[in-house]
């Protein structure tokens, strides 16, 4: 503790100029004071002034008023500093002396004589209020006041609490009257050294180094650090924890960049045709009658469906067609015959069967021939059986589909995975992506097809924590950590969902 006992001398009256021994001073009593402050004693005794002592220069002759003086000799109030916890009780002895000698340092002069003395014993609390008193004896009167105040930076009832206001990284505070800390705005904690972050800043995912700031820990973003950062390269996905890539509906693949719903997202099929999804970026258009092409974008001739039967020839008209029938046939599609089996109407070895009591007939055609009169060679490609832009080819009694790259199956209906050819070397994992296959390489290899052996293995130093698996070749950093459940971060170094006191990393 540390404080000051202050004594203010106000007026001394010694009208007759007398000493304590009854003698008078000549020419008058040139008066100075000796003050002794000590611990409380029920009966004041001689001995050391345990709390301090002080003397004044000559302040006046016989009777005088003592003016306040802040510096130099004759300072008033008198200061008695102490470096201990103020006990709350004290004993004070004030002696008035006459000196025939030096005004400024009468204490050292020989022949000094006591004029009078007073003794005060009691309790005194620390405070700014002066306690005023007056002591009389038969010859003199002394008016004075006194108090105990704490030294600078000391506080409390006994001046025992040291507190120094500060505003640096070890504290941002002022001192209360009792010595406790009062944090400056924006700061908190026992020593006011912890900044109060931006209101709403996520307790675990954000932090601050000064008030009203919100700095995000790795894997988090947003003004309040409450939005996770998805995996680098995540196209159509979101995250609930950092570095995740949970695909939006209709998207797939490691980076959610493979379109599983091409039909809905791109509407590739034209002219009212039906679109069917078939794997990543795969689709098939089923055309309405009168349209053809991969996207049903090509309008067919009205005669393309060969509507005229029995060898009738078809002529396109503005919104329809017209059939020119051969001899012996009539009707919109030349479907009615005036011939009978007697006219040998069946070509290419077809057998004629009479119908309706011989008034009409039906031809039974040999293989590879069709038509009412077996007049047409069978074209197995007319039904557009090849999907995904495959080319149809007649091969004798059958037909085959010649598929475009990336498709297979009898009707080219199957999408071939780019990964089926196992393009990744050295045990790399293949991912079908929009622009071709992408390889995730095992430790020690890189390149588009994991064909390059890495002399310095980015995973060799074990950069991934908490049992995470390390992959190279997926990111510009040369490695990617695949975190186990319960951990996040670019190196899987952060546990998920720890209590607020957990010391996160910046």
């Amino acid at each position: 503790g540390s404080g000051i006992f202050q004594l203010r001398l106000q007026e001394f009256v010694n009208q007759r100029g007398m000493l304590a021994n009854g003698q008078s001073c000549e020419p008058g009593c040139r008066t100075f004071f000796r003050i002794c402050l000590k611990h409380f004693q029920a009966t004041f005794s001689e001995g050391p002034c345990t709390f301090g002592n002080v003397s004044t220069p000559v302040l006046g002759t016989n009777s005088f008023v003592v003016r306040d003086k802040n510096s130099g000799s004759g300072r008033n109030p008198l200061q008695l500093p102490f470096n201990f916890t103020w006990p709350g009780t004290f004993s004070l002895n004030i002696q008035a002396w006459h000196t025939p000698g030096d005004d400024l340092r009468p204490e050292t002069s020989p022949g000094n004589s006591l004029i009078s003395q007073i003794i005060i014993q009691g309790s005194l609390a620390v405070g700014k209020i002066w306690r005023t008193d007056e002591q009389n004896d038969t010859l003199t009167r002394l008016s004075y006041s006194y108090r105990v105040i704490c030294s600078d930076n000391y506080y409390g009832e006994s001046c025992s609490r040291l507190c120094k206001k500060r505003d640096d990284h070890f504290g941002h505070y002022e001192c209360q009257p009792d010595g406790s800390l009062s944090c400056l705005p924006g700061w908190t904690g026992k020593y006011c050294d912890q900044p109060i972050c931006l209101s709403g800043c996520h307790e675990q995912n954000g932090y601050c180094s000064k008030p009203d700031e919100c700095i995000c820990r790795p894997g988090w973003q947003g003004r309040l650090c409450n939005e996770c950062i998805p995996h680098n390269g995540c196209r159509h996905g979101t995250c609930s924890i950092p570095w995740q890539c949970a695909c939006d509906e209709g998207w797939g693949g490691l980076f959610c960049d493979q379109d599983l719903n091409y039909c809905t997202h791109h509407s590739p099929c034209k002219n009212g045709s039906t679109c069917s999804n078939s794997g990543p970026k795969g689709y098939t258009c089923t055309c309405l009658p009168g349209y053809t092409g991969e996207h049903c974008e090509l309008g067919l001739s009205k005669c393309a469906s060969n509507p005229c039967r029995n060898g009738g020839s078809c002529k396109d008209q503005e919104n329809s067609y017209h059939c020119l029938c051969p001899p012996g046939y009539y009707g919109q599609h030349c479907e009615h015959s005036t011939l009978t089996c007697a006219d040998s109407p069946c070509f290419n070895g077809g057998s004629c069967r009479e119908r309706n009591q011989g008034s009409s007939y039906a031809c039974e055609c040999p293989p590879n021939f069709t038509g009412s009169n077996c007049e047409k060679k069978v074209d197995r490609c007319t039904s557009n059986p090849c999907a995904n832009g495959g080319q149809c080819q007649n091969r004798g009694p059958s037909r085959t589909c010649r598929c475009r790259p990336g498709f297979t199956g009898t009707h080219c209906e199957l999408h071939i995975s780019d990964c089926a050819r196992s393009p990744c070397a050295h045990g790399g994992t293949c991912h079908d992506l929009e622009n071709g296959p992408v390889c995730t390489c095992p430790a020690g290899f890189s390149g588009r097809r994991c064909e390059v052996r890495i002399t310095h293995d980015a995973c060799a130093s074990g950069p991934c924590f908490n049992g995470a698996t390390c992959y190279t070749g997926l990111s510009p950093n040369n490695f990617v950590c695949n975190c186990p459940y319960g951990f996040v971060g670019s190196r899987c170094e952060f546990p998920v969902g720890l209590p607020p006191s957990f010391p996160w990393v910046a």
Epitope: R166, H169, F170, G171, S209, I215, P503, V505
Partner: antibody, heavy 121, light 107 residues
């Protein structure tokens, strides 16, 4: 018992960058009660405070060295580091790392044993 | 920039009291720390917060700080107290050390 250990090259060429690391053992560098500082002492001379860092990455530097100093922290390794660029012979000194305690009003209660760095070609 | 001034040297006889001063503008309004450094060793904190002793520091070491001066007092000085002593304070966010005082124990 907390221990601090400095490590790094003992010889650096003029104009190059001095790099030192302090490894903390026996306690977490992520405690909110401490800052982690660097102090140096040229041969036969007094102590000079270089700068310090909090576990969150907040740094404070001696204004006379600020343009050349970078202090960083790696909480996963319980380490903090010093980089001093464009060194000259005047940067030859014993470099200490120390723990500055908020509770001790910034007093440094634990020090490394120091490492002598000589700047010479 | 803020400076702390110490006397270069102080000599004391064994068993006597050594006082080392540290002066700086309004130093009493800052917290002063004191460090002891023996040759070839790292500094050791002997006083913090003006007058408090860390555990393990003998009672003969005491400190005070008011006005412009902080003082480290070694009462009953022993030969083992011979060392360099540095005062330290914080000026805003910068640590400042005094120039150091060599304490020599005579005899």
């Amino acid at each position: 018992e907390v221990q601090l250990q400095e490590s790094g090259p003992g010889l650096v060429k003029p104009s190059e960058t001095l790099s030192l690391t302090c490894t903390v053992s026996g306690g977490s560098i992520s405690s909110s009660s401490y800052y982690w500082g660097w102090i140096r002492q040229p041969p036969g001379k007094g102590l000079e405070w270089i700068g310090d860092i909090y576990y969150t990455g907040s740094t404070y530097y001696n204004p006379s060295l600020k343009s050349r100093v970078t202090i960083s922290v790696d909480t996963s390794k319980n380490q903090f580091s010093l980089k001093l660029s464009s060194v000259t012979a005047a940067d030859t000194a014993v470099y200490y790392c120390a723990r500055e305690d908020v509770i001790l009003r910034g007093g440094s209660d634990y020090w490394g044993q120091g490492t002598l760095v000589t700047v010479s070609s | 920039s803020y400076e702390l001034t110490q006397p270069p040297s102080v000599s004391v006889s064994p068993g006597q009291t050594a006082s080392i001063t540290c002066s700086g503008q309004r130093l009493g309004d800052k917290y002063a720390s004191w460090y002891q450094q023996k040759p070839g060793q790292s500094p050791v904190l002997v006083i913090y917060e003006d007058s408090k002793r860390p555990s393990g520091i003998p009672e003969r070491f005491s400190g005070s700080n008011s006005g412009d001066t902080a003082t480290l007092t070694i009462s009953g000085t022993q030969p083992m107290d011979e060392a360099d002593y540095y005062c330290q304070a914080w000026d805003r966010d910068t640590g400042v050390f005094g120039y150091g005082t060599r304490v020599t124990v005579l005899g």
